[in-house]
């Protein structure tokens, strides 16, 4: 596919501004025009880019779902970061959703983790120091926890 | 994870009209990007037309425009291609794909998704 191939119909924003590309590259908060001379300003609030680029649209911004609350507006270089509720945490594995965090640990374990918006509460063994994981069991004795106050922003794109 | 499922495929007599239609499912594509790409009989994948995720700015390949026409309803999660006057060298299987963004020429960037493609066949 050749660049002069495509050739666009582009109802381009007024507002929307306009730079020359470096090498062919279009710097953070924009991406490049049709015809590959022009760079043109991603839509604040809208839109976004991070690095510099050849594309031929903006990345959408993230919207924050309920249950998330938002660190940081979507600016045209950064997407929005987004970080589950307090109570509520989000597993790498399944990072569409945030769940919610365990009250305590089950009998024979104690809590050494608190409820953070990246991770459950952490439970080891008495004994043994050994971390739980997986699923947790019907809890018989819970000791109980308040959630963790948040160290740093969990951010999710797209 | 988004399912991409094109439709509308057929054959035409030359000069005449078809619309394809791209309907995807798992997971809204209205935060994608979206373009269609075709493939004729023994050559390679080649870029056709790509819209942004808002669908106010749209791309042609040069052998497709004033043509073809491309859009999307984000209510139906679904992606169009409105194919006019159409030549025997439009003759091909089009696919639509899904992705965060595309690059001048057509590659996808970031997570994207591809359909299985409907053929297009052109003949008197």
């Known amino acids: 596919i050749t660049q002069q191939d495509l050739a666009p119909q582009q109802r381009a924003a007024p507002q929307q501004k306009r730079s020359s590309p470096s090498e062919g590259l279009c710097p953070p908060g924009h991406h490049i025009s049709e015809d590959g001379r022009d760079c043109i300003s991603c839509k604040y609030g809208q839109d976004y880019s991070t690095h510099w680029n050849d594309l031929l649209f903006c990345l959408r911004c993230t919207r924050c779902d309920s249950g998330e609350v938002e660190l940081s507006p979507c600016t045209t270089t950064r997407n929005t970061v987004c970080q589950c509720e307090e109570g509520t945490f989000r597993e790498e594995d399944s990072p569409e959703m945030c769940r919610k965090c365990r009250t305590g640990c089950p009998r024979g374990m104690v809590k050494v983790g608190d409820c953070t918006p990246w991770s459950d509460i952490e439970c080891v063994h008495k004994e043994s120091g050994t971390k739980h994981s997986g699923e947790v069991p019907a809890v018989e004795e819970t000791v109980t926890s308040s959630p963790g106050t948040p160290a740093s922003p969990c951010s999710l794109s797209g | 994870e988004v399912q991409l499922l094109e439709s509308g495929g057929g054959e035409v007599q030359p000069g005449g009209s078809l619309r394809l239609s791209c309907a995807a499912s798992g997971r809204t594509v209205s935060n994608y990007a979206m373009s269609w790409f075709r493939q004729a009989p023994g050559k390679g994948l080649e870029f056709v037309s790509a819209l942004n995720w808002g669908g106010d700015t749209t791309y042609y390949a040069e052998s497709v425009k004033g043509r073809f026409t491309i859009s999307r309803d984000n209510a139906k999660n679904t992606l169009y291609l409105q194919m006019s006057s159409l030549r025997a060298e439009d003759t091909a299987v089009y696919y639509c794909?899904?992705?965060?963004?595309?690059?001048?020429?057509?590659?996808?960037?970031?997570?994207?998704?591809w359909g299985q493609g409907t053929l297009v066949t052109v003949k008197p």
């Open positions: 794909a899904a992705a965060q963004s595309f690059r001048r020429g057509g590659a996808p960037y970031g997570d994207n998704y």
